[in-house]
């Protein structure tokens, strides 16, 4: 069953080069 | 549940290489970044750098970029560290850590360096 | 890099008192309407354990003695009332820009 967390928005990934930036750091879709 | 398990304690002489494997379960393993986290005796946490589960790319903080390899086994949800050329310095516990909606950590690997 | 400062280094607590401890980010670690700052505990020889995720958020399992503030570059993480399960060194750490921690603070029972 998922978390209940997962349900809150923004959804994110910690994620390198992603989310138009060339560093890493957290990506998140609301 | 998600879970992160690591190899265990690796005794190395310097100039040795050592490779250890941090095997995920409880979630799909090519969603989520695997991260690397140093921790010296008695110190704090240092990021070593992450690796993309999906593609397989690398990228490594600026202190560990060199002697140091992050890989995968993605038919096994496992994540690999090696460290070429051990030096006294690299003695420490490594830490493999992902997030996957919440922070989740192995449980650490010792890498003892030692002549 | 974005640089994390706690305070204090140690800090001695009476069974049943209020613990406070400070994390002052070199930069703003907000994004998405979200603070990417979060808290550990660790014990000697075992993994950190989370607290509380973006910077106020009680992790699943953690006592609400444990909570946690701030914004933007100050953070605050409170243990209220203190118990002897408590004795551990805390970690700040953001996940904004790359990864990085606190030097830790150490609590121990005066």
């Known amino acids: 069953r998922r978390r209940r967390r997962d349900t809150h928005f923004p959804i994110c990934i910690f994620c390198c080069g992603c989310c138009h930036r060339s560093k890493c750091g957290m990506c998140c879709k609301t | 549940q998600i879970q992160l398990v690591q190899s265990g304690p690796e005794l190395k002489k310097p100039g040795e290489t050592v490779k250890i494997s941090c095997k995920a379960s409880g979630y799909t393993f090519t969603n989520y970044g695997m991260n690397w986290v140093k921790q010296a005796p008695g110190k704090g946490l240092k990021w070593m750098g992450w690796?993309?589960?999906?593609?397989?790319?690398?990228t490594y903080a600026d202190d560990f970029k060199g002697r140091f390899a992050f890989s995968l086994e993605t038919s096994a949800s496992t994540a690999y560290l090696q460290i070429n050329n051990l030096k006294n310095e690299d003695t420490a516990t490594y830490f493999c850590?992902?997030?996957?909606?919440?922070?989740?950590w192995g449980q650490g690997t010792l890498v003892t360096v030692s002549s | 890099d974005i640089v994390l400062t706690q305070s204090p280094a140690s800090l001695a607590v009476s069974l049943g008192q209020r613990a406070t401890i400070s994390c002052r980010a070199s930069?703003?670690?907000?994004?998405?309407?979200?603070?990417?700052m979060h808290w550990y505990q660790q014990k000697p020889g075992q993994p950190p354990k989370l607290l509380i995720y973006r910077a106020s958020n009680l992790e699943s399992g953690i006592p609400a003695r444990f909570s946690g503030s701030g914004s933007r570059t100050d953070f605050t993480l409170t243990i209220n009332p203190v118990e002897a399960d408590d004795v551990a060194t805390y970690y700040c750490?953001?996940?904004?820009?790359?990864?990085?921690f606190g030097q830790g603070t150490k609590v121990e029972i005066k």
């Open positions: 690796i993309n589960t999906y593609t397989g790319e690398p």
């Open positions: 930069e703003s670690v907000d994004s998405y309407g979200n603070s990417f």
């Open positions: 850590t992902t997030y996957a909606t919440s922070w989740y």
């Open positions: 750490q953001q996940s904004n820009e790359d990864l990085t």
